[in-house]
């Protein structure tokens, strides 16, 4: 299940991955040295019955329909890390692999 | 980040894991031999700013606030399998470990 990829011109209403650039400087996150910007992507769209479901559980909860369950929502189902250079609180430059920074795939869960 | 656990008596409004029993017979899924029922759990509740976020990405998308992003939603962040006995489409009895059947933890993503 590879998920759907869309862009700002897409007419897709279902759960889809869209491009999004995160600009650390625009956030005022000046402790990040590299990258200054990166391609993060995000998930948006509707989760119709049985569409792009990551887990069997999602379908089962829809069937059981418990109190307070809002139905599945369009959310990252595969994430990847990026490598970063940044300052720590001791003002040392740190190299690190930061998990959960890029959305590789979206689905309904 | 261990997530919150709630029950039907909880007054918690934030993202939480609730107990849910899935009953295959009640669904009419008569090809499942065992278990007939299992404790699946489900996720429900509100995702306030920075609460129970699984990924740094979730916070970054909230900051960037792109068109069509609905904000994070309460969804499974850790799942586990269950072992099952069931009939396949050739009417053979299969034993298998089925992934994504139990919610171990909920979070906002």
């Amino acid at each position: 299940n590879l998920g759907l990829d869309c862009d700002e011109h897409s007419s897709e209403s279902r759960c889809c991955r869209y491009p999004l650039t995160v600009d650390f400087e625009a956030f005022g996150w000046d402790w990040i040295i590299a990258p200054k910007r990166y391609k993060a992507n995000y998930c948006s769209g509707q989760c119709e019955y049985m569409f792009m479901q990551k887990y069997p559980h999602t379908h089962l909860v829809q069937q059981a329909n418990p109190r307070g369950s809002a139905g599945p929502c369009c959310t990252p189902t595969k994430m990847s890390p990026i490598n970063m250079l940044y300052f720590n609180d001791k003002q040392q430059i740190i190299y690190g692999k930061i998990p959960g920074m890029v959305v590789d795939r979206c689905g309904c869960s | 980040n261990l997530g919150l656990d709630c029950d039907e008596h909880s007054s918690e409004s934030r993202c939480c894991r609730y107990p849910l029993t899935v009953d295959f017979e009640a669904f009419g899924w008569d090809w499942i031999i065992a278990p007939k029922r299992y404790k699946a759990n489900y996720c429900s509740g509100q995702c306030e700013y920075m609460f129970m976020q699984k990924y740094p990405h979730t916070h970054l998308v909230q900051q960037a606030n792109p068109r069509g992003s609905a904000g994070p939603c309460c969804t499974p962040t850790k799942m586990s399998p269950i072992n099952m006995l069931y009939f396949n489409d050739k009417q053979q009895i299969i034993y298998g470990k089925i992934p994504g059947m139990v919610v171990d933890r909920c979070g906002c993503s």
């Epitope: 400087e25 040295i33 990258p35 990166y38 391609k39 430059i93 190299y95 | -």
Partner: antibody, heavy 117, light 106 residues
Amino acid sequence: QVQLVQSGAEVKKPGASVKVSCKASGYTFTSYYMHWVRQAPGQGLEWMGIINPSGGSTSYAQKFQGRVTMTRDTSTSTVYMELSSLRSEDTAVYYCARDENWGFDPWGQGTLVTVSS
Amino acid sequence: SYELTQPPSVSVSPGQTATITCSGHALGDKFVSWYQQGSGQSPVLVIYDDTQRPSGIPGRFSGSNSGNTATLTISGTQAMDEADYFCQAWDSSFVFGGGTKVTVLG
């Protein structure tokens, strides 16, 4: 305007060390990181490391760790790159480059370091 | 470690379009910059963030990036564009391609 002026060419023997300087002008020295990049004759560009002129903290490319030291002198708005245990493969033009929001900009004029016995 | 691969040379007639490629694994997921280096000169940034031109860079320079390949395009190439061009991306370090020598014929 922003300018980076580097020290002159050097000839060194294998095993020796070299210290290249890069004097910045036309901007607030402590507000921008500085990179060092080298280019062997007829070859591509190779990133060596970065220094924060404000606090002096550094990060070096794995290849150069243990052999390179980057320092700065805020009183003269100068950064330095020292490379030790020189070998013939270190013969290259060494550049300093300011870390701008959009990339390495501008670059110094380069310093040729020749390692020869 | 991450690698960027460029063709060693590209030839183009004056006024024609020069296309320089830079390939790397899932390069489209990263932002790519391009540097121009004239003979005996220091590098100059001509494209950043795949497609953006710094101020002072002529409009004939453009960039794109998708899949495994980033491309620098010089439209209406002039004699002054004869230089080496290097692509660059951030992975676990600042990585440069090997460079492409653009020769303007005639």
